[in-house]
């Protein structure tokens, strides 16, 4: 009589998380009598997965009717597979006894679980940076299996090369995580730019997952300041304009000072957006020249996005004011500048 064989035909089975896994096992003989048990792992620490004789295994069902007297198929189906179910499963035949005695084990079937990576989450720098500076973006995705995964970074459709990526853990695990950092050099034109983290994995059937971050969250474009005087009006009032241009974000406070004293403070709001995503703002100040005996020092002070204030100053000469002023006069575009207006 031929010796009983325990046959596990598949060396490995790969299943998507959430699906059911079928682990096949047949025996070559009904003799000797005794139960079949399924274990995950081998040796003394093995985990009992299914035992028809006793116990409650809600996720495991026999493929064939185990009560049939001539049943030699002890395949099982495990439902709702998770990455934690990965491992090598052994179909083990026992000989009846008190207790039952292990007679023969199948060769084992390795169950690998294909788990989709979570949606990539991209996080940018905690504080904004200005053009020409380098900022770092981080992309994280978790819970995938197998370990092989591809992650790419793009800025406005162009792949980034200054990238560092790690997949953890390095050794064998039920599931893995990926973390990648991309370094991006900002330009003034990046308000509308976007970085994309693209994750490709066998479970995604060629349709990669993407996480995005807008550079508008990371960039600060400081304003240009230009102060000009409009024509002298008949009533001896001078209209001075402070043009604040090409700034981002919109959070901006403008203060007019006359001879160092605050004249007016304004907050930018509901500004129209430029094509490049930046904003412009113009503020006017009417100065009554006749009310002053001495020259008037005017300062346009701009505080942008919590940064130190930028000033443009100039002086209006009270002594010699013609009734009509010709062309507009602008203050130079430097941090702090005084300009005499005649």
């Amino acid at each position: 009589e031929e010796e009983l064989q325990v046959i596990q035909p598949e060396k490995s089975v790969s299943v998507a998380a959430g699906d059911s896994a079928t682990l096949n096992c047949t025996v070559s003989s009904l003799i000797p009598v005794g139960p079949i048990q399924w274990f995950r792992g081998a040796g003394p620490g093995r985990e009992l997965i299914y035992n028809l004789k006793e116990g409650h295994f809600p996720r495991v069902t026999p493929v064939s009717d185990p009560t049939k007297r001539n049943n030699m198929d002890f395949s099982i189906r495990i439902s709702n597979i998770t990455p934690a179910d990965a491992g090598t499963y052994y179909c083990v035949k026992f000989r009846k006894g008190s207790p039952d005695v292990e007679l023969k084990s199948g060769a084992g079937t390795e169950l690998s679980v294909r788990a989709k990576p979570s949606a990539p989450v991209v996080s940018g720098p905690a504080v904004r940076a200005t053009a020409e500076h380098t900022v770092s973006f981080t992309c994280e995705s978790h819970g995938f299996s197998p370990r092989d995964i591809t992650l790419k970074w793009f800025k406005n459709g162009n792949e980034l090369s200054d990238v560092q990526t790690n997949v953890d853990p390095a050794g064998k695990s039920v599931s893995y995580s990926i973390r990648s950092t991309a370094r991006v050099v900002l330009t003034r034109r990046d308000v509308h730019s976007q970085v994309i983290c693209e994750v490709a994995h066998v479970t995604l059937q060629g349709d990669p997952l993407r996480g995005t971050a807008n550079l508008s969250e990371a960039i600060r474009v400081p304003p240009f300041l230009e102060v000009t005087q409009q024509s002298m009006r008949a009533d001896n009032q001078v209209n001075v304009t402070c043009q604040v241009t090409k700034f981002y974000p919109q959070r901006l406070q403008l203060t007019w000072l006359e001879n160092g004293n605050v004249s007016r403070t304004e907050m930018a709001s509901a500004l129209p957006e430029n094509k490049d995503g930046t904003y412009n703002w113009t503020s006017w100040l009417l100065v009554n020249v006749s009310a002053h005996r001495d020259d008037v020092k005017l300062t346009c002070q701009v505080e942008h996005d919590g940064q130190p204030a930028v000033n443009k100053s100039f002086s209006v000469k009270v002594s010699a004011h013609p009734k009509e002023q010709g062309s507009n006069t602008a203050a130079e575009n430097t941090g702090t500048n005084e300009r005499n207006i005649y």
Partner: antibody, heavy 124, light 106 residues
Framework: QVQLQQWGAGLLKPSETLSLTCAVY????????WNWIRQPPGKGLEWIGE???????NYNPSLKSRVIISVDTSKNQFSLKLSSVTAADTAVYYC??????????????????WGQGTTVTVSA | SYELTQSPSVSVSPGQTASITCSGD?????YAWWYQQKPGQSPVLVI????KRPSGIPERFSGSNSGNTATLTISGTQAMDEADYYC?????????FGGGTKLTVL
């Protein structure tokens, strides 16, 4: 505990078909195999065959060509038909249950409860 | 086909131990059942799965099974134990009975 009550024709002529029924009282009908066994006068027991609630059958190879065992789960009954009887089929016929429950495996259950027996005589 | 062999008869004095044997090829690799049948009655299961006793069966009934032989042992045999005893096993989904042993209590 299951109880079995059986009935059927006791006197048959050769070539007729023996027909017996066994009613099941108590227990879960779906956790048993239902058996027929016979015992010729002064002789030993001979297993005829079995059926479970879903209609799965096993028969004694020596009788297989003449035997049909069926089940009526709505009535909790199972039946035996043995065709083309001869005098050699004269015997006491028993129905019996084999409880396998949820903790059994193949060949781990035998005949734990028996019916009262029906004497069947085949005579010309 | 598989065969189970029993000695036709065994005699025992009351209070003594009766051993009834059943032999078959590698019977120890299978489960053995034992049934008691008294005259004019249906068989009653006295031992199942080699050595297990159904509820209601006296403790004096015990069983063993190894190698090629299964044994039903009745210790402290009583007159009421006089009956025919049948062993049974399964072979390829077929129940096989031994020829039976008549136990006589002298």
């Amino acid at each position: 505990q299951v109880q079995l009550q059986q009935w059927g024709a006791g006197l048959l002529k050769p070539s007729e078909t023996l027909s017996l029924t066994c009613a099941v009282y108590g227990g879960s009908f779906s956790t048993y195999y239902w058996n027929w066994i016979r015992q010729p006068p002064g002789k030993g027991l001979e297993w005829i065959g079995e059926i479970n609630h879903s209609g799965s059958t096993n028969y004694n190879p020596s009788l297989k060509s003449r035997v049909i065992i069926s089940v009526d789960t709505s009535k909790n009954q199972f039946s035996l038909k043995l065709s083309s009887v001869t005098a050699a089929d004269t015997a006491v016929y028993y129905c019996a249950s084999s409880h396998y429950g949820s903790g059994s495996f193949p060949d781990s259950y035998g005949m734990d409860v028996w019916g009262q027996g029906t004497t069947v005589t085949v005579s010309a | 086909s598989y065969e189970l062999t029993q000695s036709p008869s065994v005699s025992v004095s009351p209070g003594q131990t009766a051993s009834i044997t059943c032999s078959g090829d590698k019977l120890g690799d299978r489960y053995a059942w034992w049934y008691q049948q008294k005259p004019g009655q249906s068989p009653v299961l006295v031992i199942y799965q080699d050595d297990k006793r159904p509820s209601g069966i006296p403790e004096r009934f015990s069983g063993s099974n190894s190698g090629n032989t299964a044994t039903l042992t009745i210790s402290g045999t009583q007159a009421m134990d006089e009956a025919d005893y049948y062993c049974q096993a399964w072979d390829s989904s077929t129940a096989v009975f031994g020829g039976g042993t008549k136990l006589t209590v002298l």
